[in-house]
Interface confidence: low
């Protein structure tokens, strides 16, 4: 004979637990149905009647199977330095992530608590490590034979052009200037761009740049503890 299926509410066998998507109601001392995501418990179960579920109201949600009396409130609108990457629905909270050109300096469980603008490397410095959703750009001085003449969060140092006859030697922030009509070969057709990080759902990790090159996002705060690191600008 097939095993008898118990319908909720039912009293569990001593020492056993309720099944998946059921919970044990202490008052009724019965296994009762949970409410599905997007719903909440309007009326709790009794010995003779199961849980009565109702849909979450606007701007509220439940993400899991539950028996909460009220749905959770969605977070308020995203702030000006953020974009909404997940809308508030009955089954999920709103998620705000940093807008392009910014990174998350301080994460929260989902989304970001504090966005900061990506550092821009000034002339003479290039991007050593591009910014990500949760870490700032790292700048480095341009090595001999390379230059960067831009203030940018994406440009790397690029080689000086090689001249037959040099009119003005290149330096870290300027390309070489040739006297002949054309250089023997140009290694610097233009700025080399690293891609901006694609704005996707925030990773839930705390940013941990190396101390020596770590960003200062203090320019976001009224009187920050330290100026931006060398080679960077808060512009």
């Amino acid at each position: 004979l097939p095993a008898q299926v118990a319908f909720t509410p039912y009293a569990p066998e001593p020492g056993s637990t309720c099944r998946l998507r059921e919970y044990y109601d202490q008052t009724a001392q019965m296994c009762c149905s949970k409410c599905s995501p997007g719903q909440h418990a309007k009326v709790f179960c009794t010995k003779t009647s199961d849980t009565v579920c109702d849909s979450c109201e606007d701007s509220t949600y439940t993400q899991l199977w539950n028996w909460v009396p009220e749905c959770l409130s969605c977070g308020s609108r995203c702030s000006s330095d953020q974009v909404e990457t997940q809308a508030c629905t009955r089954e999920q909270n709103r998620i705000c992530t940093c807008r392009p050109g910014w990174y998350c300096a301080l994460s929260k469980q989902e989304g970001c608590r504090l966005c900061a603008p990506l550092r821009k490397c000034r002339p003479g410095f290039g991007v050593a490590r591009p910014g990500t959703e949760t870490s700032d750009v790292v700048c480095k001085p341009c090595a001999p034979g390379t230059f960067s003449n831009t203030t940018s969060s994406t440009d790397i140092c690029r080689p000086h052009q090689i001249c037959n006859v040099v009119a003005i030697p290149g330096n870290a922030s300027m390309d070489a200037v040739c006297t002949s009509t054309s250089p023997t070969r140009s290694m610097a057709p233009g700025a080399v761009h690293l891609p901006q990080p694609v704005s996707t759902r925030s990773q839930h990790t705390q940013p941990t740049p190396e101390p020596s090159t770590a960003p200062s996002t203090s320019f976001l705060l009224p009187m920050g503890p330290s100026p931006p690191a060398e080679g960077s600008t808060g512009d």
Epitope: G75, S76, R77, R94, C96, L106, R113, L114, C115
Partner: nanobody
């Protein structure tokens, strides 16, 4: 005009205690989540602790759990952070920040910070 003014920082020996205060004005303090955040010398931000409007729910970073206590006095619009058993790793600028509930959980208002230096 929104203002958050931290005080109570200073130099303390390892194992010592400090109590930080944050006086708030210009926004509805008593209905705002409040947070302590610190910024180390390496400029890394670290969430320390937060507290809900009525003070019943508090959360702490693992690195300070059991040593720091966050509290608030809504009548005085003041946030506190009691820091005991301080370690050299706790050296940082401590900011109080407010989420007034209209910004999707982001910290809209910041103080200017108070420096805590823990010497060995």
């Amino acid at each position: 005009d929104v203002q958050l003014v931290e005080s109570g920082g200073g130099l303390v020996q390892s194992g010592g205690s400090l109590r930080l205060s944050c006086a708030a004005s210009g926004f509805p303090f008593s209905s705002s989540d409040m947070t302590w955040v610190r910024q180390t010398s390496g400029s890394v931000f670290e969430w320390v602790s937060d507290i809900n409007p009525d003070g019943q729910n508090t959360r702490y970073a693992d690195s300070v759990k059991g040593r720091f206590i966050i509290s608030r006095d809504n009548a005085k619009s003041t946030l506190y952070l009691q820091m005991d058993s301080l370690k050299t790793d706790d050296t940082a600028v401590y900011y109080c920040a407010a989420d007034p509930g209209s910004s999707g959980g982001s910290l809209s208002y910041w103080g200017k910070g108070t420096l805590v230096t823990v010497s060995s």
